[in-house]
Every structure is written in C-alpha cells, then in structure tokens.
C-alpha cells in the first residue's frame, strides 16, 4: 500500500511535462493560417450581404479562443460554440447538400447551382475549408510543426472537432428536401463513419426534413449499374427511414454530362439521363 | 386522399392469396406503405413495410409466410400458405404526406378468411 | 424480437378526468423515440394520435400527449371526453425491423 502511495505521487500529467514541443503524427497548422482566416472572413463577408454585419477580428478571436492555449487533445464542440454563435447562418428550405469523400465535385456544382449550399458555401465552412491548426497547452503559440492525427493520436483535436461541430449544426438547420452527393467509385458509397454518416445523418431533424435525396456518382463511362442497390446504400436508407425521413435515390451515371446540364439544362442532350 | 385494401376473401388452407392497396388522391409510389393485420377480438400485428426503393422488411414471425410489393399504383401483400391463424382483418396504411414507419393514412381493411 | 407491454388494460375514466396509459418495450426503439400511438374505434381502421413519442399528428385534440424515451413511454388523455373510449396502440420501431410491434392494446371505458 505505501509502496503504491509513492507510484501514485510520481505520476506526472501531460501538463507538467517539461516545456518542449510535442511531437504529433499529423501535419503542422497551415503557414498564415491566422492571415488566411481573417482574410477569408473579409472576402466572404463582402461578397454575402446578409452577413456584412459580421466582426471578422471578433470570428478571428472566436476561432483562436477555441484551441489557444489548450491541450490538443483535449478540445470540445463547447469550445466553439463562441465561433459557431458569431457564424450563424441559414439555408433555405431545399437548398441543403451535403457531400461524402466527392468534395470537389459538390463544390463544382454548387458553384453552378448558385442557390444551393454545401458547408463550404457558409462562412465557418469556407474559413477553414483545407486548413489545419492546432495550439498547445499553457502558451500562446500555434504549433506549426505538427497537429494531433486523427487516427493516430486523438479523434478530440481542434480541426476534428470543430467539423464535426459545424457538420452537427448544417444538419440541425436544414429543412424540407436534403441533398447528399455520395461517391460511388468508393467500397463503401456510404460509410458510417465519414462525418456524414456518423454526424450529419443523425442530426437531421424530422420536424423539419421530408425526404433525403441522395445522388450517387458514377465513375467510369461504362458503369451502368444501379448504385441505389448498394448494400451501403440500403443501410442508409434505412437509418434515414428509421428517423423518419423519406429517402430517395439517383444514380448520376455521367457526372460532367451532369455538370454541363446544371449549366445548360436547355441543351437537347440534357433531356436523356445522366 | 385514402387508400383501400381489396381481395380478401375466404380461401382453403394453403391456397396463396394476394392483397391490393390502393391510393386515391396521390401516388403509392413516392410512399411508405405498410401492412398490417387484426385477427378477429385481437390486437394489432405488424406485418412488414415497403420503401420507396422497393426495399421490404418484414416481422420476425412474417418473413417467408408474406411477400410485399409494389406496382407503379399499387402495393400488393402476398400470402403465401395461409393457415386458419390468417384470419384476420388485413390494412394497408400508408405514411402521407410525411413520414415513414408513421402511419397517418389507413384503408377501411379487408377480410381473410381462412378455413377448410 | 421485441416486446411491448401496455398497462394497465381495460381502465376505466370519467368525463373531464385524465388517463394514463403506458407503453413498456423490451429493448430501446429506434432512435430513442420511433414509436407512435394508435386510437382504434370497433369496426374502424387504427388513427394516428401521436407519433416519435410526442409529437401530435395533424388534427388530432391537444388534450391527448405523448411522453417517454427509449423503452418507457406514456399516453395522456387529459379532460377524457365520451369519444375517447377505445383501444389504443403503441408502435414501436427498432433497429431490427423484424422486432417491430404493437403494443396488446388498451382499452379506455369512459363512465
């Protein structure tokens, strides 16, 4: 028991190590990354009217409060909440999509489709979009040599949690027929454990969401089959059914046919499928 | 908008036996439709439930004796070998306009009667 | 496969007083709250009172309520009037379809 005692007085917490640099298995915060938040805030907020009321130095003081000076591991979605108030935002009833592992693509057509939305279309979502950063317990410093890996270090890191924050909160606001862009080339076309299926599935509220309209995407020119038959697929619909949201299904064989449509849907090529 | 079952009548054991839902007002096919039975004096059974998709699921106790499925208009529950215990009054219900296991729209039902 | 036990079974009301029927399922519904309650006249089909486990179906009085998450659940009827008595139904929906179920039934006499 004594011996035990003297074990129990030697254990040294994270916080009381010495003062070098920890070393992650991810890759640093993004060079500027202070620069390229506000920088983005300022674009953003002049090309959308309805929030030239935000303070970008007070988003910039909210984004840097959640992780300065905290252990990296050891962030919250609490901690954003500051950030997440700051950045409120609304999307139109039908205008939601979501995306999973085709992020280039839903961009693209968002691009296109002016009046609808991805999470990169709203402020939080295009201030960080790409970017990595990470703080360290007790200074004031961002760690430019190395952030917490998801895998390999922890799940409860600064970039984690705050997509996984603001992805809770786009599902929780949006309302009437959702989108979701899937990648059909992948194994699993839906996978639960993307921050689609394991956030934004279960945070759609019934109240508000009729139906879930997903789009699966094709990849090669000659893949004719029906993806809304995937086994993944299924598994999705039924986990949307199950909240009580109807779910549809697209197979979108030809996705620059499909780009060239949103663009030109006059174009007599546009009224076979895609 | 309703629905209504039809094609239940008194049937042999074992003679297989199809069951019709449909809608008045809009279209089963962009619906959720479930089936449903009551014995006569009895409670609700939980039959099973077709998607959108076509996808079936089934109760523990239907899987292999029912087979639901569906038309461009309508929903059809198949009874494969009835048995005395099919008896029983048999609703289709569907879930308009929202919805999905909710069911806020049921047809009148129908009556199986199974007896030698 | 799952069960759901409604209690008590009949119960007796008087008009302008408040029943209570509960709804006990064997394992946790869907989501925490995917289960619905039926209203059932003799020789009519089952109407939609209540649905992911308070929320009231269109049309439906507000003197009915639903309550309860996860495997405990509760219909009110408050200020029972002469129409309500019935057999009432919980449903409830699980992550395995082939448990989903109605509850036995309750059935409400109203004095």
């Known amino acids: 028991s004594g011996l035990n005692d003297i074990f129990e007085a030697q254990k040294i917490e994270w916080h009381e190590l010495p003062r070098w640099r920890q070393q992650w298995s991810g890759s640093g915060t993004t060079s500027r990354f202070p620069e390229t938040v506000l920088a983005r805030c300022v674009k953003y907020t002049e090309v959308h009217p309805e929030m030239r009321h935000v303070d970008c130095q007070s988003v910039w003081d909210a984004f840097k409060g959640a992780f300065i000076s905290k252990y990296p591991c050891n962030i919250t979605e609490e901690d954003y909440q500051p950030l997440v108030k700051l950045g409120t935002q609304t999307v139109p009833c039908n205008k939601t999509l979501l995306w999973s592992r085709i992020k280039d693509l839903a961009h693209q057509f968002t691009q296109v489709q002016r009046d609808m939305f991805t999470l990169e279309d709203m402020l939080l979502g295009y201030l960080a979009d790409d970017l990595t950063w990470c703080g360290e317990f007790n200074t004031f410093e961002i760690n430019y040599q190395s952030c917490p890996d998801w895998r390999k270090d922890c799940s409860n890191n600064p970039v984690s949690v705050f997509w996984k924050t603001v992805s809770r909160r786009f599902a929780e606001t949006a309302c009437g027929v959702v989108h979701v862009m899937l990648n059909g080339s992948r194994s699993k076309i839906f996978d639960k454990n993307s921050t689609f299926g394991s956030v934004e599935v279960h945070n759609l509220q019934p109240e508000k969401v009729q139906a879930l309209e997903a789009w699966v995407i094709h990849g090669g020119r000659e893949d004719s089959r029906d993806l809304c038959q995937d086994p993944t697929i299924k598994e999705l619909e039924s986990i949307i059914s199950k909240r009580n949201i109807r779910f549809f299904c697209k197979n979108i064989y030809r996705p620059d046919k499909f780009l060239q449509c949103v663009k030109n849907p006059e174009d007599s090529s546009c009224l076979s499928g895609i | 908008q309703s629905v209504e079952e039809s094609g239940g009548r008194l049937v042999t054991p074992g003679t297989p036996l199809t069951l019709t839902c449909t809608a008045s007002?809009?279209?089963?096919?962009?619906?959720?439709v479930t089936w449903v039975r009551q014995a006569p004096g009895k409670g609700l059974e939980w039959i099973g439930i077709i998607y959108i998709s076509g996808t079936t699921y089934y109760a523990t106790w239907a899987k292999g004796r029912f087979t639901i499925s569906k038309s461009a208009t309508t929903v059809d529950l198949r009874i494969a070998s009835p048995t005395t215990e099919d008896t029983a009054t048999y609703f289709c219900?569907?879930?308009?306009?929202?919805?999905?296991?909710?069911?806020?729209?049921w047809g009148p039902g129908t009556l199986v009667t199974v007896s030698s | 496969a799952a069960v759901l036990t409604q209690t008590p079974s009949p119960v007796s009301a008087a008009v302008g007083g408040t029943v209570t029927i509960k709804c006990q399922s064997s394992q946790s519904v869907v989501n925490a709250n995917n289960l619905s309650w039926y209203q059932q006249k003799p020789g009519q089909p089952p109407k939609l009172l209540i649905y992911?486990?308070?929320t009231l179906a269109s049309g439906v009085p507000s003197r009915f309520s639903g309550s309860g998450s996860g495997t405990q659940f509760t219909l009110t009827i408050s200020s029972v009037q002469s129409d309500d008595a019935a057999t009432y139904y919980c449903?409830?929906?699980?992550?395995?379809?082939?448990?989903?179920?109605f509850g036995g039934g309750t059935e409400v006499v109203v004095k």
């Open positions: 449903l409830g929906v699980y992550d395995d379809d082939g448990d989903n179920a």
């Open positions: 219900a569907a879930a308009w306009p929202v919805g999905t296991y909710v069911l806020p729209l």
């Open positions: 007002g809009f279209s089963l096919s962009r619906y959720y």
């Open positions: 992911l486990a308070s």
